[in-house]
């Protein structure tokens, strides 16, 4: 995974050259023919590639320009057409199709289950710490602290609904005001977008696939970050979310509703509850400063308990300690009062793997974290493989056209809004934005859905998760109804405001441009994806948290210069690209800065050195592990047994001369095999549905 060679004497135009094949439509670069833009700070260079060593001939030719890497790849059909098959072939193909569908649904099921278990694992590892974040008294006065707590807690428990429900219970108990809760909700919105970003990392094995998947996942992150960047200051200044939601809550006389329908959980719960069951009340109790809860385990042991509420007489030091004056008496020596006591009798143990192990939460969490990531990774690879074999030819064309085509003029603008509704509806059905966006990520990766279409679907998903929260709020008990409904509505209007900011006008769709930029960087320097994840979801929130604890003065003292530098850089960047003549010659580019400040190349060298020690060991594992380890170390030479690393090896073999392949391939399939795209063995058995 070393960076692409950069030629110092290349032409000023950063043209990209690629091999072509007879009859092949122009395709986006794939694993064997990847090209990448270098950092815009470096001298523009030409990217070139050689054919695989076994090709018949190569002709040095004028380089031909290749399509934008963001164009969807053409998923070619390599199989025998349906009409050309005999009856046996048709029957075989039909059952093959059914088998694939069953496998796809099976892997999808385990994919969703592994997401659920991943969330449980994160709660076991960081749940108690997350609860302690909430017990910080500064949240009330510092919205920035509230925001980062929302991010950190949601990242730690991998569930925005968990962090939101903690906030609701704290507001209901008057430990938190709605005003203080709003930034936490905004943070939870950001935190929940880490899940699909983690899922995107699993597609690291293929550069072009990873570029699209990572951009598709981070479009959610950027939307949330940008929305907070604009709306948090607006909310702090005007309290518009608090005011609007308060008016709505006060103007309606809500009656307690039904619980939000658990549609997906009904299917996944029977499996996930056999793995582990958690007592999520513990995190809430810690958040509400319950000392006893700190020593409780999150792993649920008893599933059937009998709770008996009785009133018992207890002695108290003085009449001042009595429950009420009328419930106070003496026996002549001691003062007594009556207390409501709940006796909990354990009846039946839970039926999950960890019930009798009595392991510490951290151990259970670590085991589940590793296993769920492996299952998640494995399922994702299999889903991508199955989809890759199914979505070919006309099937792919139909699906891609259906999903990515706009309505006819003049209603084209409506398509995106329909996608928002579809995203909201789908999320409402699966009851989780993480599940929906995570399922979307591999589809973006393999090129079924464009980022432009994924963006409104993701925005819809954000809305869908808030409608679920509103329904859940309506089902709350009387005392929590108002606060939970107001918080759910704050969440809803925050997302609506975000959509109004970053969707209606195409020019304002900044998240797409930012995600594509990050996708390009991450496709070239794959370690940067992990770096981004750590920086944005852990280091920045933790730094702000630490500075906030130190007090307002420290936060402002450090924050203001940092913000000032960022604004300065952005303004300079804008002037450089739009009107460089305004600037002095030195500032017209970034060359005045040392290389490490303007390029990732030196950092890449550092990372490569650092991971060098893993290179001989990291890749000789099964294909499932390969994607995870390729992400960890740029290892082109270390893994002959693993497809993804073989591809990398091939991709890096010779890169000196711009080449064009002669149009001598027998058919598309051979050409694609030569490019390492389809295993030769698959080509004969492939069947087309249409």
């Amino acid at each position: 995974m070393a960076p692409w060679p950069e030629l110092g004497d290349a032409q000023p135009n950063p043209d990209k050259y690629l091999e072509g094949a007879a009859g092949q439509q122009p395709t986006a670069p794939d694993k064997s023919k990847e090209t990448n833009k270098t950092d815009n700070t470096e001298a523009p260079v030409t990217k070139i590639e050689l054919l695989p060593s076994y090709s018949t001939a190569t002709l040095i030719d004028e380089p031909t320009e290749v399509d934008d890497p963001w164009n969807l790849p053409t998923l070619q059909d390599s199989g025998i057409k349906w009409s050309e098959r005999d009856t046996k072939g048709k029957i075989l193909c039909f059952f093959q199709g059914i088998g694939r569908l069953i496998l796809l649904l099976g892997f999808l099921y385990f994919f969703v289950c592994s997401l659920d278990i991943l969330s449980s694992a994160f709660q076991l590892v960081g749940g108690k710490m997350a609860g302690q974040f909430f017990s910080n008294s500064s949240i009330m006065s510092n919205p920035l602290l509230g925001l980062v707590i929302g991010v950190l807690v949601t990242v730690l428990v991998q569930s925005s609904s968990t962090s939101t429900s903690i906030v609701v219970s704290m507001v209901s108990s008057s430990l938190l005001t709605v005003r203080a809760a709003i930034p936490i909700i905004m943070g939870a919105n950001i935190g929940t977008s880490i899940t699909n970003t983690i899922v995107a990392l699993m597609q690291v094995g293929d550069r072009s696939e990873f570029r699209r998947a990572f951009a598709g996942a981070t479009v959610h992150d950027f939307f949330n970050w940008l929305s907070v960047l604009v709306l948090l200051p607006v909310e702090v200044a005007t309290h518009y979310l608090e005011i609007i939601t308060q008016l709505i809550v006060e103007s309606f006389h809500f009656k307690n509703g039904e619980d939000a329908p658990d549609l997906l959980k009904v299917i996944t719960k029977p499996f996930t509850k056999l793995i582990v069951q958690l007592d999520k009340k513990v995190i809430s109790q810690i958040a509400m400063n319950d000392e006893k809860a700190k020593n409780k385990s999150l792993v649920k042991i008893w599933c059937k308990t009998f709770t008996n509420k009785t009133q018992i007489n207890v002695t108290v030091p003085s009449t001042a300690n009595c429950t009420s004056p009328s419930l106070c008496w003496t026996d002549g020596i001691q003062n007594w009062t009556m207390k409501n006591v709940t006796y909990k009798e354990n009846i039946a143990k839970c039926q999950h793997i960890f019930v009798n192990f009595h392991l510490p939460d951290l151990a259970v969490g670590t085991i589940l974290l590793i296993l769920s990531l492996l299952v998640l990774c494995g399922c994702l690879i299999m889903i991508v493989k199955i989809l890759g074999s199914v979505l070919k030819g006309q099937v792919a064309t139909v699906i891609k056209k259906t999903i990515n085509t706009d309505f006819p003029f003049p209603f084209a603008w409506l398509t995106g809004y329909l996608a928002i509704l579809v995203g909201a509806g789908m999320t409402f059905i699966v009851q989780s934005s993480s599940v929906f966006t995570s399922a979307l990520t591999p589809l973006i990766g393999i090129g079924v859905i464009t980022i432009e279409r994924a963006y409104p679907l993701t925005l819809g998903s954000n809305i869908g998760t808030t409608t679920t929260a509103i329904l859940a709020a309506l089902a709350s008990p009387g005392n929590a109804l108002r606060s939970s409904l107001q918080i759910a509505l704050c969440h809803f209007f925050f997302n609506i405001s975000g959509i109004l900011l970053w969707y209606p006008i195409p020019f304002t769709r900044l998240p797409i441009r930012m995600a594509k930029g990050l996708g390009n960087i991450s496709a070239k320097y794959r370690w940067f994806a992990v770096f981004y994840l750590i920086i944005f979801f852990f280091l920045i929130p933790l730094t702000v948290f630490g500075l906030s604890l130190a007090g307002w003065r420290v936060l402002v003292g450090v924050g203001v210069p940092v913000v000032f530098i960022i604004i300065l850089v952005l303004c300079l960047r804008l002037l450089q690209s739009r009107c460089p003549r305004v600037l002095p010659k030195k500032l017209q580019n970034w060359n005045f800065l040392p290389l490490w400040m303007r390029s990732l190349k030196p950092w890449d060298a550092v990372v490569s050195k650092f991971t060098g020690c893993f290179q001989m060991r990291c890749c000789c594992c099964c294909r499932v592990c390969c994607r995870a380890c390729c992400l960890l170390c740029d290892c082109p030479k270390c893994c002959r047994c693993s497809k993804c690393c073989e591809d990398l090896e091939e991709a890096q073999e010779g890169q000196d001369v711009p080449v064009k392949a002669p149009e001598t391939f027998d058919n598309i399939t051979i050409s694609r095999e030569a490019q390492g795209e389809v295993p030769a063995s698959d080509s004969k058995t492939e069947c087309t549905a249409l």
């Epitope: 007489n313 009449t319 106070c328 008496w329 026996d331 002549g332 020596i333 001691q334 003062n335 007594w336």
Partner: antibody
């Protein structure tokens, strides 16, 4: 059955002390408080104080504080009430009564001990 | 100290009559009130505690009611053995105090 048997009548001079005993049987001595109540001739009932034999903890009516001492002997299941600096108005029937567990109602009473203070 | 005032101080009634004795507390005592019956030359006997709970062995014609500051003892149908003096007692706070008593006589 629960029984509370008090010591016999006493005649005392003003300024003297009197010690009345109350021997209990029929229940666990250390679980219930023992109260002392007095009744002057033709008058109502007046609470003197109480003792918890299990720990020896006592509580006295402010009116008698400094003059009254209550003790318990767990080996004989007997409680004692000593009243010092006797005055003529201390002439009364002194009752020991078992307190019900957890509250101040008295369910079993001794037969009473008449203490007469006269010069 | 909490004062308890019983009324009436004297009460004449016949066998079979329904009799009500009231007890007023100077402050809220909740339901921490007991009623006793005392016959001449004898020790008091517990009838009611917690304002309404009959002690074991006490006939059902005796009943108590009230909470806070006003309490009543009712004898639904007077029997010859019921003619005695009745005391209310509060155990809401120390010192424990008794009412001055209500003497029930045969008419």
């Amino acid at each position: 059955q629960v029984q509370l048997v008090q010591s016999g009548a006493e005649v005392k001079k003003p300024g003297a002390s009197v010690k009345v005993s109350c021997k209990t049987s029929g229940y666990t001595f250390t679980t219930n408080n023992m109260h002392w109540v007095r009744q002057a001739p033709g008058q109502g009932l007046e609470w003197i104080g109480a003792i918890y034999p299990g720990s020896g903890a006592t509580a006295y009516n402010q009116k008698f504080k400094g003059r009254v001492t209550m003790t318990a002997d767990t080996s004989t299941s007997t409680v004692y009430m000593e009243l010092s600096s006797l005055r003529s108005e201390d002439t009364a029937v002194y009752y020991c009564a078992r307190g019900m567990y957890g509250h101040g109602a008295m369910d079993y009473w001794g037969q009473g001990t008449l203490v007469t203070v006269s010069s | 100290d909490i004062q308890l005032t019983q009324s009436p101080s004297f009460l004449s009634a016949s066998v079979g009559d329904r009799v009500t004795i009231t007890c007023k507390a100077s402050q809220d005592v909740g339901t921490a009130v007991a009623w006793y019956q005392q016959k001449p030359g004898k020790a008091p006997k517990l009838l009611i505690y917690w304002a309404t709970t009959r002690h074991s062995g006490v006939p059902s014609r005796f009943s108590g009611s009230g909470s806070g500051t006003e309490f009543t003892l009712t004898i639904s149908s007077l029997q010859p053995e019921d003619f005695a003096t009745y005391y209310c007692q509060q155990y809401s706070s120390n010192p424990l105090t008794f009412g001055q008593g209500t003497k029930l006589e045969i008419k």
